[in-house]
């Protein structure tokens, strides 16, 4: 037949299109949490507030427990910003007297666990420097890339000093993905 | 910034009812959860109920079948509707935006922001 | 329903004096208390949530101890403006009971 020369060699099937509105994300901002007891290598995990305010979670992604649990295989768009708070003060105690328990620096981590892997994985790392800034110093961090996630994946926010974390307002400290 | 903003002070008679509002603003009554807290004078404060975001309700058993509890998303306002007064009933009543904080992986309820208070005298 | 227990209802002190008040729920309350402080004709003001963290803007000079069902609220150098009554708030479960209140007064 004239024309069949133009016919696929073999049918392509085309998956529809998906709505964004249906694929899980989730934003989580800053609860107030009191500072716990953690393994002095271990930096600790941070509270989320997950329906109340800017917060939410849809489609599967559910918050559990320091945890972001992801609901289907994919690639994700990860971020948190973390704003840390202090006075310098402390700073110059540090240097005067080596005092350990108040830092010369902040660090974020946000963090996957995966059940089948024993060892959390570290997917980004933000350190800035305080000692250095003004009286009354504010420092935010922010992190943010894509990863392929796995369903099951969990992820969390460490800081490296829960004290320091500003938790007045949900604008200001914040934790989110999205399937891409 | 955070606010809430209660009606007029009320004079009402024994067996009547008594509504008293809180507008508020800078956030949203969808998003935040709304309670209801009373102070008769000289006392302690007592919670009488909360306006859940999502408009449920939970009341404190001792207000059960007297209390009614709303909400008017249109104009960002709660109202607490108290029935049948008695003298008992004459109080300071406040509203207050519920915080969650947590300690270790449990978390609570406390009262970061108040309304101004509303007097309710009960009086024959 | 729990009930929170606060001593003394009242103290006398003075500008300058360390003050302790306690708060006694009846049944384990996980540190998930809060302390208020409120001034004649005022609403109440929160001062420390989980037991023992400041609330933002709080003067360090308050602070708050305790777990399980005994707790205290310690103002370490009394100013006058701390001067007013302070309640106790278990957060764990409705409906979310308030100690009786302690009364703060000049000596």
């Known amino acids: 037949l004239k024309g069949q020369e133009f016919a696929p060699s073999h049918q392509q099937v085309y998956a529809p299109l998906r709505a964004d509105g249906d694929k899980p994300r989730a934003h989580l901002t800053v609860v107030r949490q009191t500072p716990t007891q953690h393994f002095k290598n271990q930096f600790p995990a941070l509270h989320w507030e997950h329906e109340l305010g800017l917060a939410f979670t849809k489609n599967r992604m559910n918050y559990t427990n320091k945890f972001l649990l992801i609901p289907e295989s994919g690639d994700y768009f990860i971020y948190s910003q973390v704003t840390f708070r202090g006075m310098t003060s402390e700073c110059s105690e540090i240097r005067q007297a080596g005092r350990p328990n108040k830092p010369d620096s902040i660090t974020v981590v946000i963090t996957k666990v995966t059940d089948s892997y024993p060892e959390p994985t570290q997917l980004l790392m933000g350190t800035k420097s305080v000692c250095e800034v003004g009286s009354n110093w504010f420092q935010p961090i922010y992190l943010g890339a894509m990863f392929s996630l796995q369903e099951g994946d969990k992820l969390m926010v460490n800081v490296s000093d829960i004290s320091l974390v500003d938790y007045t307002k949900e604008d200001k400290t914040f934790f989110g993905a999205f399937l891409l | 910034q955070v606010q809430l903003v209660q009606s007029g002070a009320e004079v009402k008679k024994p067996g009547a009812s008594v509504k008293v509002s809180c507008k508020v603003s800078?956030?949203?009554?969808?998003?935040?959860?709304v309670h209801w807290v009373r102070q008769a004078p000289g006392q302690g404060l007592e919670w009488m109920g909360v306006?859940?975001?999502?408009?449920?309700?939970d009341y404190n058993s001792k207000f059960q079948g007297r209390v009614t509890m709303t909400r008017d998303t249109s104009t960002n306002t709660v109202y607490m509707e108290l029935s049948s007064l008695r003298s008992e009933d004459t109080a300071v009543y406040y509203c207050?935006?519920?915080?969650?904080?947590?300690?270790?992986?449990?978390?609570?309820?406390?009262?970061?922001?108040w309304g101004q208070g509303t007097l309710v005298t009960v009086s024959s | 329903d729990i009930q929170m227990t606060q001593s003394p209802s009242s103290v006398s002190a003075s500008v300058g004096d360390r003050v302790t008040i306690t708060c006694r729920a009846s049944?384990?309350?996980?540190?998930?208390l809060a302390w208020y402080q409120q001034k004649p004709g005022k609403s109440p003001k929160l001062l420390i949530y989980?037991?023992?963290s400041l609330q933002d803007g709080v003067p360090s000079r308050f602070s708050g101890s305790g777990s399980g069902t005994d707790y205290t609220l310690t103002i370490s150098s009394l100013q006058p403006e701390d001067f007013a009554t302070y309640f106790c708030?278990?957060?764990?479960?409705?409906?979310?009971?308030f100690g009786q209140g302690t009364k703060l007064e000049i000596k």
């Open positions: 049944e384990d309350i996980y540190s998930g």
């Open positions: 800078g956030f949203s009554v969808t998003r935040y959860n």
């Open positions: 306006m859940w975001s999502g408009a449920n309700t």
């Open positions: 207050a935006r519920a915080g969650r904080y947590y300690v270790d992986s449990n978390y609570y309820w406390d009262f970061p922001y």
């Open positions: 708030q278990e957060g764990l479960k409705s409906p979310y009971t």
């Open positions: 989980g037991a023992s």
